[in-house]
């Protein structure tokens, strides 16, 4: 039975040209996390596999950095980065858990400077 829950940063905003950390956290389960996929819409951004390490999609190699932890750092943000991001946690023995984050990339003067997980 799947007892875990995914906690995410929820709706976040960041400044154009800046960086943001996408972070999910799996709680309320003792299941072992064996892989985490990060996606935007239908595009695979990155995978962190317990045995194989990190893989960053070539399309995002210049702007995506692994971590911290199982999170993902997006750099050099543009307004086109606005949208939904998904973390897909592969676990044993529970199965798959999914979390959703909505990122809004704003012009510099509009973004909230205190947004959680935001990198100055």
């Amino acid at each position: 039975m799947m007892t875990g829950t995914i906690e995410t940063t929820g709706n976040i905003s960041a400044e154009k040209g800046g960086s943001i950390i996408l972070q999910c956290h799996l709680s309320s389960t003792t299941a072992q996390v064996t892989q985490v996929n990060w996606e935007q819409q239908d595009q695979l951004l990155a995978i962190c596999n317990a045995d194989l390490g990190w893989h960053i999609s070539p399309s995002f190699k210049d702007r995506v950095a692994p971590g911290p932890g199982l999170g993902l750092t997006l750099q050099s943000l543009t307004v086109n980065d606005t949208g939904e991001y998904f973390c897909i946690y592969h676990t044993y023995p529970d199965g798959t858990y999914t979390g959703r984050i909505f990122l809004e990339v704003l012009e510099s003067s509009v973004a909230e400077h205190g947004a959680r997980f935001q990198i100055p």
Epitope: N37, E39, Q41, I47, N49, L52, H55
Partner: antibody, heavy 118, light 107 residues
């Protein structure tokens, strides 16, 4: 449990437009996921055609992009496929399917055979 | 587009046999591969996702492995209900593409 059911004409004339509908039960297509069309010519492999997401975003296979349109009717919890200018090569079993995050397909309709012939 | 090349295209085996099907991607897809089983007149059924993760309810005799460009699907001990056609699919980038299929027949 989500269930998908395709419906539409089984015979379409060459150069006409193929139109199919997928009715989804057990889940609202506006709640989550992407809702896809995948086809399989007789005795051949599978070809992903495109999807409409829960938010209404569409994406199509570039090999079909100029001919394919996927739309939805949220009031009926249905999504539809239109494929224009069909030829005999479009004869296939057409499936609707739900895409899960990670881009695999755990739920499929039973499929409907569409024959293109005059 | 990423091409998925499956081999063999057909295979004859007996109940109890161990069977292996391979799938080669035309570029690195890391672990983004799924495997499906299709019986005549039926829709494909998802067995394995992310190269090695079994769907809930799928018997443990079905397994998948591999990363990068080379992937393997194994049935450890064939059962009568396993005779079907099997497809790999890359879930790495659109357009999502499938292998041409491997037909598993009774010897």
């Amino acid at each position: 449990q989500v269930q998908l059911q395709e419906s539409g004409p089984g015979l379409v004339k060459p150069s006409q437009t193929l139109s199919l509908t997928c009715t989804v039960s057990g889940y609202s297509i506006t709640d989550d996921y992407a809702w896809n069309w995948i086809r399989q010519p007789p005795g051949k492999g599978l070809e992903w055609m495109g999807y409409i997401s829960y938010s209404g975003h569409t994406r199509y296979n570039p090999s079909l992009k100029s001919r394919v349109t996927i739309s939805r009717d949220t009031s009926k919890n249905q999504f539809s496929l239109k494929l224009s200018s069909v030829t005999a090569a479009d004869t296939a079993v057409y499936y609707c399917a739900r895409k899960y995050y990670g881009s695999w397909f755990p739920d499929w309709g039973q499929g409907t055979l569409v024959t293109v012939s005059s | 587009d990423i091409q998925m090349t499956q081999s063999p295209s057909s295979l004859s085996a007996s109940v109890g046999d161990r069977v292996t099907i391979t799938c080669k991607a035309s570029q690195d897809v890391f672990t983004a591969v799924a495997w499906y089983q299709q019986k005549p007149g039926k829709a494909p059924k998802l067995l394995i996702y992310s190269a090695s993760y079994r769907m809930t309810g799928v018997p443990s005799r079905f397994s998948g492995s591999g990363s990068g460009t080379d992937f393997t699907f194994t049935i450890s001990s064939l059962q009568p209900e396993d005779f079907a056609t099997y497809y790999c699919q890359q879930s790495y980038s659109t357009p999502w593409t499938f292998g041409q299929g491997t037909r598993l027949e009774i010897k």
